[in-house]
Structure formats: structure tokens, C-alpha cells
Interface confidence: medium
């Protein structure tokens, strides 16, 4: 069954915290300020203990406190939630603004940053109201960390609750070639703009960005799904000039061994402007970092209308192949490749233990957790289970 | 919202020549296409033609030689021509647009036109 | 041009069947199929696309798959509304031509 890409749309589950489908156990802090405001009485619309969690230390001018919540298996974040101390509607402590900070394997810890650079998030106005921030670009993790923010010497609390799903994808990372500009009237950004690894050389290694969020490019690169955002935002994109070799190659890291059905890549054909759909894909695979390329590559010839310029995904073919990691070289069929997409159809090999530390229990993909209720600012389908959704012009 | 309008004479003698518009509303024809497809009565669909955003066209070459499409962007209006009908060619025709699915997502309501003397 | 053969040609089921159609395509067109329903008296609408994604606002009882030349398109529990005209179509090579249809009906 050839599925498209994740939808980010569909992914807005509350992942427990309210619930209690997170376990006091997988909720720490930085410190406490007591046992009363300790990291476990954050769940949202909670009263436990004195209602919420409040740090020992001030949050300013340092930034240093944080309640951390792991969430066991990688999930995409798409949204997060935040309220002030409760304490029997007596509370006036909360935080007007924070940071994220997030891991996928609790050694590497990468800031949330959104579309244009921003770290600070608006937080809350009361203790009471629920304010929600759509996380734009989600982020893929397994450990979340709130750092509460204030702009002078006072008390701050925190009751959270984080929306997503699981990461059925599998995909810890991705090393690409730097994006490159491609310069017509205007210039067109190509660079994968919410890459979150190392880049060195032009080499972008360990981390996941644009090629991994669920965003599909339009058929016409200069424009957008996102606002205020510059041409070609929703592409990486790669001149034929600057590869001798004829192709881009691409590694892609797993989570653990799986069988991979296909890859899906999301290109632009746009031909009148140079971008065409790669002529052939050519895959390899291997089991661990250190081991030999496992047999023949795979191959795959792409045919089609090449004078049909509409955006669409190609489905790569991988036959079942097991692997951790997968290399794979696009061949340039013309000026440009384009991407805006990949995703893989895989399951995991039974008995195959996951590749970051600490042993993952099952989790179902779509996690039991309801969305909030009772929000002034939310639009929500009636019942539980159902995907949350951001009103139009609630705070950010 | 989204929204597809055919026009047509209804009814064509033959060997004559048929001229059908499409009128959008609700998107821009630079950013989307717009096909058309025929439906013979009580029959399936045959694509007929496409004109992609940029104003490229690409034919159903069995019907090429009879077939023009072009388009007005800024009255957003596309326009098929077919010739030397026949009453074979008795049919609905439909415009639809693809978008972001590499599919015809949205339909027009179609117009009937019948070859007939 | 490829030939999209489907069959059958028609299906009479009671509400709460489950209901498969096949697509067959005379050369490989990738994933790059189309399923449309069309009811009686109204234009086709889309159902599936990229042989097994679901179109907005479609209920998760129709479902698609396949790959290369063989495509099957799913109900899994029929419902009397789903009353129509289904066609697959190939979005892969121009002409992008369609299978003859398979008309649903209800007992």
C-alpha cells in the first residue's frame, strides 16, 4: 500500500500530559520550588499539589530552568500548551513567554526556532487560559523541554500539554548537500531552511528539516503554502552545475532496522524554468553505521510526461530491503532538482532494538490522548480523539 | 470557494465547429490547470486536453487535430474549440482543475451539447 | 496510450458489503492513478489519488492501493449513498485516459 506523505494536518493529538497517558515518571524539571509545584503537577488543566510546576531559580535574567517531558518514542510536534499555577483558582503565577528546546536521543539538544528565526514563543496573559502555539515548522522529537521566560525578577509557573503523533517514519536524520540559490528574475532560495543538524562544507548532517515536515511544494516553486516566506521556501534544490558526478546523494539514518517498501519524493517538473524530475534513483542499503553497503543497489528508472509540469511525488520501488541506513543518488535529468518531500514506507524488523539509548515500549500511532476541552479560543471536532485545531487569530 | 462554469451552444450541427468556456472563480489560473474531459451519454470519460499554469497545452493526440484550448488569465475563462463535429462527439463536457494532487480535484457542473441536424 | 482495463463492469451489493474494484494498466504507471466517483446525474468527484491517498473530506472507508500495473480500489463497508459510477485513471503519460467505470449498485 502506497501511502503519501504524513499529513502535519491530521497530527494534533494530545500526547498525554492532561490525560495521563505520560507517567509522573517521564515528567522532570531542572528544580522545584517544593514537592507541591514539583515537575509532575505541569499536566494541563490539572490541580494537582499547589497547580502547577514552578521552579526554585528565578527565570531571569538567566534562562536556565526547565520542565522536560519525554515522550519515550519520537514524535512530530506540531503544537504545545500552556497555562499558569492553578492552586484552587487562586494562582497568579504564570510565564508571558518561552523557549523549546527538544532531543531525539537525549544527548543532542536543538532549540525550537520557527519559519524566520524567532525562538521566544508569547505565552500566557493569566494563570487560567489556555494558549496554544501551532509549532510552524513541527518538530520531531523524543524529549521536549519548556524553558519559561520573564523580563524581570519574578515567579513563574507552568502546566503543559504537547500535540502531535507518533513518528511512524522512523527517520532520525538526513545528510544532504547545502541548498542552492537559483537565480532568475528574483532570486529563489533553495536551502533547506529548518534544518536542525551540523552543516559543514556544505555538507548538512544529523538533523531533519523541510525534506521531513510534511510540507508539499506547489507545481510553481516560486510560490508558497506559507506566508511571508521567499521564493522557493518550500524546496531544496540542487543545480546540475555544481554535481560533476551527474547526481545528489543523500543518506538517510533510522531509528532501527526496517524493511523498506518505497521512498517517496516530492519534485518539482516545472521544466520552462529548469527543474525537472530526476531521470533514476539508485539506492543502497547497509545495517549500521560502520558496515559495508549490503548487495546490488536498487534501481529505478523514471519515465512519465516530460512535458507535464505539475509538482508530484515520485515513488521509488525498494523491494523489501532491510537496512538502518539507506544512501541514495538522484540523477539529474535536467538543470535542477527540486524536493520538497521524502518520506518511506517501511516496517520495523521484529526484535530489532531501536538505535538511541533507553529501550521504547509500544506506543500506538495514533496516541489515546483527547485534545483540550472547554478552550474559549479552540474550534474542536466533538469527540475525543479527534485532532486539535488552532481557531483563527487565537494568541500565538 | 472553489468553482468551475462551462458554457456551450448545446447543440451543434455537423461538421460545425464547437467553442466552450470555462469560467473559475475561487483560484488563479496561473497557479492551477485546467483540464477537459467528455462524457458520452451513458458512457466513461475520455480526456480531452490540458492547459497547464504557464499556458503550456498538452492534446490527447487522437483528437489533437481538432482540438484548440486557450486561456484568459485575467478574466480567469479557458476556452476549447473542437471541429468538424460529429455526432460521436455528442457529449458532456466537463473542465476540471488540478492542483497540489496531481489530480482533478474540482469539477465543473459540465454542458451538454449534441451533434445533430 | 495506455489502456486502464477495470472490472466489473458492474456490482449489485446490499448496504454493509464490502466492495473491491481493480484497475489494470497495460504498461507501469508508478503510483500515479486516480479513482473518481461519479453519482447520477453530477460530475465526477475525487476520491483517492497517488493510488492509495485519500482526498480530503473522503470517509476512510474508501481506500486505495497498488503499484505498477495492478490497482484495486476498496469500500470496506457500503453505505447506500456511495450509489455511483466509479473510474480509476492514470495520471502517469498523456493521454491520461480513464477505465470504463464500474457502476455500484445497492440490492
Known amino acids: 500500500d502506497m501511502k503519501g506523505h504524513f499529513d502535519p494536518a491530521k497530527c494534533r493529538y494530545a500526547l498525554g500530559m492532561q490525560d495521563r497517558t505520560i507517567p509522573d515518571s517521564d515528567i522532570s524539571a531542572s528544580s522545584s520550588w517544593s514537592d507541591s509545584t514539583a515537575a509532575r503537577h505541569s499536566r494541563l488543566e490539572s490541580s494537582d499539589g499547589d497547580g502547577a510546576w514552578c521552579p526554585a531559580g528565578s527565570v531571569f535574567p538567566k534562562e536556565e530552568e526547565y520542565l522536560q517531558v519525554d515522550l519515550q518514542r519520537l514524535h512530530l510536534v506540531a503544537l504545545v500548551g500552556t497555562q499558569g499555577r492553578h492552586a484552587g483558582g487562586l494562582g497568579k503565577e504564570f510565564s508571558r513567554s518561552y523557549r523549546l528546546r527538544y532531543s531525539r536521543d537525549g544527548r543532542r539538544w536543538m532549540g525550537w526556532k520557527d519559519r524566520w528565526g524567532q525562538e521566544v514563543i508569547s505565552g500566557n496573559e493569566d494563570p487560567e487560559g489556555v494558549v496554544l502555539k501551532d509549532l510552524g515548522p513541527p518538530m520531531v522529537a523524543r524529549l521536549v523541554r519548556f524553558y519559561p521566560r520573564a523580563d524581570r525578577v519574578m515567579s513563574v509557573c507552568l502546566r503543559v500539554e504537547l500535540y502531535g503523533c507518533l513518528w511512524r517514519d522512523g527517520l532520525l536524520s538526513y545528510t544532504a548537500p547545502v541548498g542552492q540559490t537559483m537565480y532568475l528574475s528574483e532570486a529563489v532560495y533553495l536551502n533547506d531552511s529548518t534544518y536542525d543538524g551540523h552543516t559543514v562544507g556544505g555538507l548538512q548532517y544529523g538533523g531533519l528539516g523541510q525534506l521531513a515536515d510534511g510540507v508539499v511544494g506547489l507545481d510553481d516553486f516560486r510560490k508558497s503554502q506559507e506566508l511571508r516566506v521567499w521564493p522557493g521556501y518550500d524546496y531544496v534544490g540542487w543545480s546540475n552545475h555544481s554535481f560533476s558526478s551527474g547526481y545528489v546523494e543523500m543518506e538517510f539514518e533510522f531509528d532501527r532496522l526496517r524493511a523498506f517498501q518505497a521512498m517517496q519524493v516530492h519534485c518539482n517538473n516545472m521544466h520552462t524554468l529548469g527543474a525537472r524530475l530526476p531521470g533514476g534513483v539508485e539506492c543502497r542499503f547497509r545495517r549500521g553505521p560502520a558496515m559495508a553497503w549490503e548487495g546490488e543497489p536498487m534501481r529505478h528508472n523514471l519515465g512519465g510526461n516530460l512535458g507535464d509540469p505539475r509538482a508530484r511525488a515520485v515513488s521509488v520501488p525498494l523491494g523489501g530491503r532491510v537496512a538502518r541506513f539507506l544512501q541514495c543518488r538522484f540523477l539529474f535529468a535536467g538543470p535542477w532538482l527540486l524536493f520538497s518531500e521524502i518520506s518511506f514506507i517501511s516496517d520495523v524488523v521484529n526484535n530489532s532494538s531501536p538505535a538511541l539509548g533507553g529501550t521504547f515500549p509500544p506506543a500506538p500511532w495514533w496516541p489515546p490522548g483527547p485534545p483540550p476541552t472547554n478552550f474559549s479560543s479552540l474550534e474542536l471536532e466533538p469527540r475525543g480523539q479527534q485532532p486539535v485545531a488552532k481557531a483563527e487569530g487565537s494568541p500565538t | 470557494q472553489v468553482q468551475l462554469k462551462e458554457s456551450g451552444p448545446g447543440l451543434v450541427a455537423p461538421s460545425q465547429s464547437l467553442s466552450i468556456t470555462c469560467t473559475v472563480s475561487?483560484?488563479?489560473?496561473?497557479?492551477?490547470?485546467i483540464h477537459w474531459v467528455r462524457q458520452p451519454p451513458g458512457k466513461g470519460l475520455e480526456w480531452l486536453v490540458v492547459?497547464?499554469?504557464?499556458?503550456?497545452?498538452t492534446y490527447n493526440s487522437a483528437l489533437k487535430s481538432r482540438l484548440s484550448i486557450s486561456k484568459d488569465n485575467s478574466k480567469s475563462q479557458v476556452f476549447l474549440k473542437m471541429n468538424s463535429l460529429q455526432t460521436d462527439d455528442t457529449a458532456i463536457y466537463y473542465c476540471?482543475?488540478?492542483?497540489?494532487?496531481?489530480?482533478?480535484?474540482?469539477w465543473g457542473q459540465g454542458t451538454s451539447v449534441t451533434v445533430s441536424s | 496510450s495506455i489502456v486502464m482495463t477495470q472490472t466489473p463492469k458492474f456490482l449489485l451489493v446490499s448496504a454493509g458489503d464490502r466492495v473491491t474494484i481493480t484497475c489494470k494498466a497495460s504498461?507501469?504507471?508508478?503510483?500515479?492513478v486516480v479513482w473518481y466517483q461519479q453519482k447520477p446525474g453530477q460530475s465526477p468527484k475525487l476520491l483517492i489519488y497517488?493510488?492509495?491517498s485519500r482526498y480530503t473530506g473522503v470517509p476512510d472507508r474508501f481506500t486505495g492501493s497498488g503499484y505498477g500495473t495492478d490497482f484495486t480500489f476498496t469500500i470496506s463497508t457500503v453505505q447506500a449513498e456511495d450509489l455511483a459510477v466509479y473510474f480509476c485513471?492514470?495520471?502517469?503519460?498523456?493521454?491520461?485516459?480513464f477505465g470504463g467505470g464500474t457502476k455500484l449498485e445497492i440490492r
Open positions: 497517488y493510488a492509495s
Open positions: 476540471a482543475r488540478t492542483g497540489n494532487f496531481y489530480a482533478m480535484d474540482y
Open positions: 492547459i497547464w499554469s504557464d499556458g503550456s497545452t
Open positions: 485513471q492514470q495520471d502517469y503519460s498523456s493521454p491520461y485516459t
Open positions: 504498461q507501469s504507471v508508478s503510483n500515479d
Open positions: 475561487g483560484f488563479s489560473l496561473t497557479s492551477y490547470h
